[in-house]
Each structure stands twice: as structure tokens, then as C-alpha cells.
């Protein structure tokens, strides 16, 4: 139990972390679902994509997301780890040229069309809070995670280490 300062300590260097290398260390095509097994789906509506959190019908196909994994180096003076303070950052792309973005002003998660190099808003620090679940923390806003709110994805502030395990910020990745 670290309290609020614990989360800040974990994430204090995110703003300053630099992504080492332009190309990802690996890419992984997976379906994304919530801790409660609802699917994250993407629908094209009026020339823009909407993101939904919903129960799929029995044989309905799950949408896939391309996760690109990047290594990110903490500055040694921040991390205390010298060259050893590495994080994994991911970008999430459900369709060509579109990436999930953190809109910190609106506390929302949006799909934006953009070219590389991607803006910082498209990068999320990968956390495992559970052996088969991941969480996505905004690079641009330490302590803020992608979460589920009212059947949509939203940005959720996590203000203590205990809340890192709350179900609404936990997601499952599956190849099927």
C-alpha cells in the first residue's frame, strides 16, 4: 500500500521518457475485451470511428487490434535505475492509419487518423496488474488509464496503488 504518492512515484518520469528506436520491438494482433469479457468493438459512423464496449452475440466475430510494442527508456536521474529503467509502451490500431488516442481534456479515448511519427497521445504504458490482464496508462498523463465507463472507453484517474486493480481498467488480450 503506497497511497497516492506511490502511484506518482511509479509514473513520475513518464513525461520525460523517450522511446528508443522508431520501429516497434514487436507487434501483436489481438482482440481486446474487458475484465468482465465484454468486447471492445469499432464501428465506422459518419466517416469517423466510434468505440463500443458490448456483449457480442454467440458467433459474432471479435474486432482485432494491432498492438505495437515500443521500448521506452527512463532518464537515469529520474528512475534511479541508470540505463536499466525500461518501460513498454504500446500503440493500438484497430484499422489501417487509425490509432487510439487519449484526449486528456475530455477524459475520453478516441480513434484518430494520423501519420507516423505518432503523437504522444497515442502511446500507453503497458501494466500487468494481473497475470492475464493488462492496463494502459497514458504517456501524456501519468496516473490516468484507459477504462470502461457507461459502455464506452474513457480515461480514468487512478489515485492509489490499491485502485490499480479495479476491474474497469483491466483488459484481456486474446488471439481468438
Amino acid at each position: 500500500a503506497f497511497g497516492i504518492s506511490g502511484v506518482q512515484k511509479y509514473t513520475r518520469a513518464l513525461h520525460d521518457s523517450s522511446i528508443t528506436g522508431i520501429s516497434p520491438i514487436t507487434e501483436y494482433l489481438a482482440s481486446l475485451s474487458t475484465y468482465n469479457d465484454q468486447s471492445i468493438t469499432f464501428a465506422l459512423e459518419d466517416e469517423s470511428y466510434e468505440i463500443y464496449v458490448e456483449d457480442l452475440k454467440k458467433d459474432e466475430k471479435k474486432d482485432k487490434v494491432l498492438l505495437s510494442y515500443y521500448e521506452s527508456q527512463h532518464p537515469s536521474n529520474e528512475s534511479g535505475d541508470g540505463v536499466d529503467g525500461k518501460m513498454l509502451m504500446v500503440t493500438l490500431s484497430p484499422t489501417k492509419d487509425f490509432w487510439l488516442h487519449a484526449n486528456n481534456k475530455e477524459h475520453s479515448v478516441e480513434l484518430h487518423k494520423c501519420e507516423k511519427p505518432l503523437p504522444d497521445q497515442a502511446f500507453f504504458v503497458l501494466h500487468n496488474m494481473h497475470s492475464n490482464c493488462v492496463s494502459f496508462e497514458c504517456k501524456t498523463d501519468p496516473g490516468v488509464f484507459i477504462g470502461v465507463k457507461d459502455n464506452h472507453l474513457a480515461l480514468i484517474k487512478v489515485d492509489s496503488s490499491e485502485n490499480l486493480c479495479t476491474e474497469n481498467i483491466l483488459f484481456k488480450l486474446s488471439e481468438t
Epitope: I25, D81, G85, H127, N128, C165
Partner: antibody, heavy 122, light 107 residues
């Protein structure tokens, strides 16, 4: 320099208990998942237990579940393995290992301690 | 559980040889696969992670490849210090599992 130093191994009778410790230094301990791996004499490597960076989640294989408990004290940069109901097949060198990246389990174990030998015998 | 089957279990080779070790998984997974080198009486050393990424400080004669169920560790030109036992390990699904090991001996 990253250092992991195990201690607490020794000879114990079947059914007995032992507590292993791992003192970590040279890195921000509370940012990393930690894992115990063991190696029986002349055999391969076997995963024993893992703990999340906050200490909120613990994971075990069936072979030790219910008998072993992994824990950590982030204030002391220390990892522990409480081993109860020990069996002859638990005889092994036990290694403390650290994950590759902050906050998650991806990327193998770049850092290992020197190991501590646990011998279970009557 | 994902079983990791390493082959061969042992091999004899000479300095300068190209050596290939394979790891076959019982089911497919993302490429969270690592390779370790272990010498007698020593702790394992991480060589490759993410199936193909070279760990800092590891000589470039070591390389990894593969995805899904088939993974390979290659030593392009075996050096005297490379005679050791090599293990693969999957980190994609719990329980974490290791291959049985491949002992590389001097011919």
C-alpha cells in the same frame, strides 16, 4: 549495478518449513514484478512464484500452490518465499529474478541472484 | 499449460560452427519467448527476449527467430565461451514454462 542476493536456504526435513529472502539493490524495486525460479540438481529450470510490482497479485504453478507463499516488502526492497509442507522434490537451488520492464511481465528475466540451495531430506 | 519442447537435448560442435537450437510450443502464443545460457554452477543469463531481441551486452553472434509455436536460437560462429546449456522460456501464459534445455558440448 543491479544486485539480487538470496538467503535462507538450508537442510530441512520433509514436512518442514523454510523462508527464503532476496535483498534487491541498484534499481527501483517497487516498479518491477519479481519471480522465484528453481533448479533441482542436474535438472532444468522451473517457475515457482511471481508477484506483481505492487504486491497485490501472486501466482503459482500447481506443484507449489497452497504450500508456498511469495511476498514482498517494497519499503525494504526485499522479496520472500515462505515454503511450508516441504517435500523431497522441492530440493533445488532457488533463484530470485527480476522482470525486464517496469510494471509488467514481458521480456524474460534479465537479472538473477546467485541462488540459495534448499535440501529437503530426513 | 504450454509445454516447451527443446531439441536437441544435447549436441557436440566445434569452435566456429553454426549451431541451431529449436523450441516447439504445444500451442501458439505471442512472441514473449526468451532464451537463456547457463554454465555449471552459475545463474542463467538472458540472451534473447521477445523471440528475437538481443539483450544488452550479448554478442551479436546470438540471434533468435520464430513465432507462434516454433522458435529458434542460432549461434552463428560458436566460441569457446559458448559451451553451456541453453533454455527457452515462454512468458505469454501462466504457468510460465521452460524448455528442458540443450547442452552444447565440445566435439
Amino acid at each position: 549495478e543491479v544486485q539480487l542476493v538470496e538467503s535462507g536456504g538450508g537442510l530441512v526435513q520433509p514436512g518442514g518449513s523454510l523462508r527464503l529472502s532476496c535483498a534487491a539493490s541498484g534499481f527501483t524495486f517497487n516498479n518491477y514484478w519479481m519471480t522465484w525460479v528453481r533448479q533441482a540438481p542436474g535438472k532444468g529450470l522451473e517457475w515457482v512464484a511471481s508477484i506483481t510490482y505492487t504486491g497485490g497479485g501472486t501466482y503459482y504453478p500447481d506443484s507449489v500452490k497452497g504450500r508456498f507463499t511469495i511476498s514482498r516488502d517494497n519499503a525494504k526492497s526485499s522479496l520472500y518465499l515462505q515454503m511450508n509442507s516441504l517435500r523431497a522434490e522441492d530440493t533445488a537451488v532457488y533463484y530470485c529474478t527480476r522482470a525486464n520492464y517496469y510494471y509488467n511481465t514481458y521480456g524474460g528475466f534479465p537479472y538473477w541472484g546467485q541462488g540459495t540451495l534448499v535440501t529437503v531430506s530426513s | 499449460d504450454i509445454q516447451m519442447t527443446q531439441s536437441p537435448s544435447s549436441l557436440s560442435a566445434s569452435v566456429g560452427d553454426r549451431v541451431t537450437i529449436t523450441c516447439l510450443a504445444s500451442e501458439g502464443f505471442s512472441n514473449d519467448l526468451a532464451w537463456y545460457q547457463q554454465k555449471p554452477g552459475k545463474s542463467p543469463k538472458l540472451l534473447i527476449y521477445a523471440a528475437s531481441r538481443l539483450q544488452d551486452g550479448v554478442p551479436s553472434r546470438f540471434s533468435g527467430s520464430g513465432s507462434g509455436t516454433d522458435f529458434t536460437l542460432t549461434i552463428s560462429s560458436l566460441q569457446p565461451e559458448d559451451f553451456a546449456t541453453y533454455f527457452c522460456q515462454q512468458g505469454s501464459k501462466y504457468p510460465l514454462t521452460f524448455g528442458g534445455g540443450t547442452k552444447v558440448e565440445i566435439k
